[in-house]
């Protein structure tokens, strides 16, 4: 803001001179600038208890430039506004107010929320998540072999994090019980994850325990500790179905 204060030289009518310094067009000893040269804005500058006229190339914070034929002035923004484009369009609000469509509000309107960083009213953003990724292989202590009960997991990503008033994200991790493929672990296979076995897909939204296909059960060679009679197998299947569990992690 380039300010110029006037000093009277050539007297016009009482207290008015045109022989002024800097940006003043007319000035007086007592009041400083009375009017400004083209494109400059008149403003009152407080010096102690006194206000004197100055001519500025741009208006200070809290003011905007008004232009009328041959007379420009810095005009105050509204009381709740820090910087403005004109009287009716604020671009930055004072502390405690939120900017919305050029206005400063105590509270944001319905459907919007206050962003305390930008001090603006913004749209409420709800959480968005991706589709579930496929289930991981069924493992027990990192092993994908041996006829034992294990777990499998699937995950999905957060595409859009919610804003303060937005809907929270649903679980992004899901774990369920499953049965490890009935096959003998090879020597170097301990802890090594195998390919995901074939299984029936659970219904959408369900998280059922996986039961091996009859084909895969038949084709796998039994080893002594895994041997069970048909009656025991049947009984176990029923119990496991009742115990089906889904573990979720909420974000």
């Amino acid at each position: 803001q380039n300010a110029s204060r006037g000093r009277r030289q050539r007297r016009m009518h009482p207290n008015v001179s045109q022989g002024c310094q800097g940006g003043c067009a007319t000035c007086s000893d007592y009041n400083g600038c009375l009017s400004c040269k083209p494109r400059l804005f008149f403003a009152l500058e407080r010096i102690g208890m006194k206000q004197i006229g100055v001519c500025l190339s741009s208006c200070p914070s809290g003011y905007y430039g008004t232009r009328y034929p041959d007379i420009n002035k810095c005009t105050k923004c509204k009381a709740d506004c820090d910087t403005c484009f004109n009287k009716n369009f604020c671009t930055k609000c004072k502390s405690g107010f939120y900017l919305h469509l050029g206005k400063c509000l105590d509270n944001c309107p319905e459907g919007l929320e206050a962003n305390n960083h930008t001090m603006e009213c913004v749209s409420i953003v709800h959480c968005e998540v991706s589709e579930w990724n496929p289930w991981s292989p069924c493992t027990k202590k990192g092993k994908t072999c041996g006829f034992k009960r294990g777990t499998e997991t699937r995950v999905r990503e957060i595409i859009q994090h919610p804003s303060a008033k937005g809907n929270l994200c649903p679980p992004t991790n899901e774990t369920r019980k499953c049965t490890v493929q009935r096959k003998k672990c090879q020597k170097g296979e301990r802890g090594k994850k195998g390919r995901e076995r074939k299984r029936k897909k659970p219904n959408k939204g369900e998280s059922k325990e996986a039961i091996p296909d009859s084909k895969s059960l038949e084709s796998s060679k039994e080893i002594p500790e895994q041997r069970e009679n048909k009656q025991q197998q049947k009984k176990r299947k029923v119990q496991d179905k009742q115990k089906s569990v889904s573990v979720s992690t909420v974000h």
Partner: antibody, heavy 119, light 107 residues
Framework: EVQLQESGPSLVKPSQTLSLTCSVT????????WSWIRKFPGNKLEFMGY???????YYIPSLKSRVSITRDTSKNQYYLQLNSVTTEDTATYYC?????????????WGQGTLVTVSS | DIKMTQSPSSMYASLGERVTITCKAS??????LSWFQQKPGKSPKTLIY???RLIDGVPSRFSGSGSGQDYSLTINSLEYEDMGIYYC?????????FGAGTRLEIK
């Protein structure tokens, strides 16, 4: 001492044009802002517009379509024309001047001229 | 347009009395306010500009104050010659606008 003096007809017929002159002495109309103000019978004052030192004009929105302020720098005079007058335009018309925001507004006034709009 | 609400619209006061006339703007006018006195058959005379600056030759019993939207003119000790109509004027924004006036009469 700056002096302003209004002149023109005191009676104008409805739908006609009101024309007034303001003659300025003690200052040049090529400096400052030269205005017309009117005072209605109920004592209400209304600023009508101005002509600037460069000859640019400003008119209040309610009169913009029918008002005109012009000047003759060689005579140091400026003029008011108000078209399509009605009885509502009956008022005392003043010319007045100011030199900018930092000084007194309308520090100098003419004595005023009463214009009656009547058939 | 900025509306200037002036009060009272008329008043009677005794000589030597302290008189206050107020003007309220419809929005903040940032001290761009003048006061005028008009006597019957005369043109208005500027008393005060920029809220509190007295025009040369105006008696010191006249004073102005205010900020934001609220402004006042005070006559400290009323004299007979002070009777007339008083107007406020805002010139913060065009069109500049006057108050409706306060008629001051002596009791």
């Amino acid at each position: 001492e700056v002096q302003l003096q209004e002149s023109g007809p005191s009676l104008v017929k409805p739908s006609q044009t009101l024309s007034l002159t303001c003659s300025v002495t003690g200052d040049s109309i090529t400096s400052g802002y030269w205005s017309w103000i009117r005072k209605f019978p109920g004592n209400k004052l209304e600023f009508m517009g101005y002509i600037s030192f460069s000859g640019k004009t400003y008119y209040i929105p309610s009169l913009k379509s029918r008002v005109s302020i012009t000047r003759d720098t060689s005579k140091n005079q400026y003029y008011l024309q108000l078209n399509s007058v009605t009885t509502e335009d009956t008022a005392t018309y003043y010319c007045a001047t100011y030199h900018g925001y930092g000084g007194p507004w309308f520090a100098y006034w003419g004595q005023g001229t009463l214009v009656t709009v009547s058939s | 347009d900025i509306k200037m609400t002036q009060s009272p619209s008329s008043m009677y006061a005794s000589l030597g009395e302290r008189v206050t006339i107020t003007c309220k703007a419809s929005q903040d006018i940032d001290s761009y306010l003048s006061w005028f006195q008009q006597k019957p058959g005369k043109s208005p005379k500027t008393l005060i500009y920029l809220t509190n600056r007295l025009i040369d030759g105006v008696p010191s019993r006249f004073s102005g104050s205010g900020s934001g939207q609220d402004y006042s003119l005070t006559i400290n000790s009323l004299e007979y010659e002070d009777m007339g109509i008083y107007y406020c004027l805002q010139y913060d924004e065009f069109p500049v606008t006057f108050g409706a006036g306060t008629r001051l009469e002596i009791k």
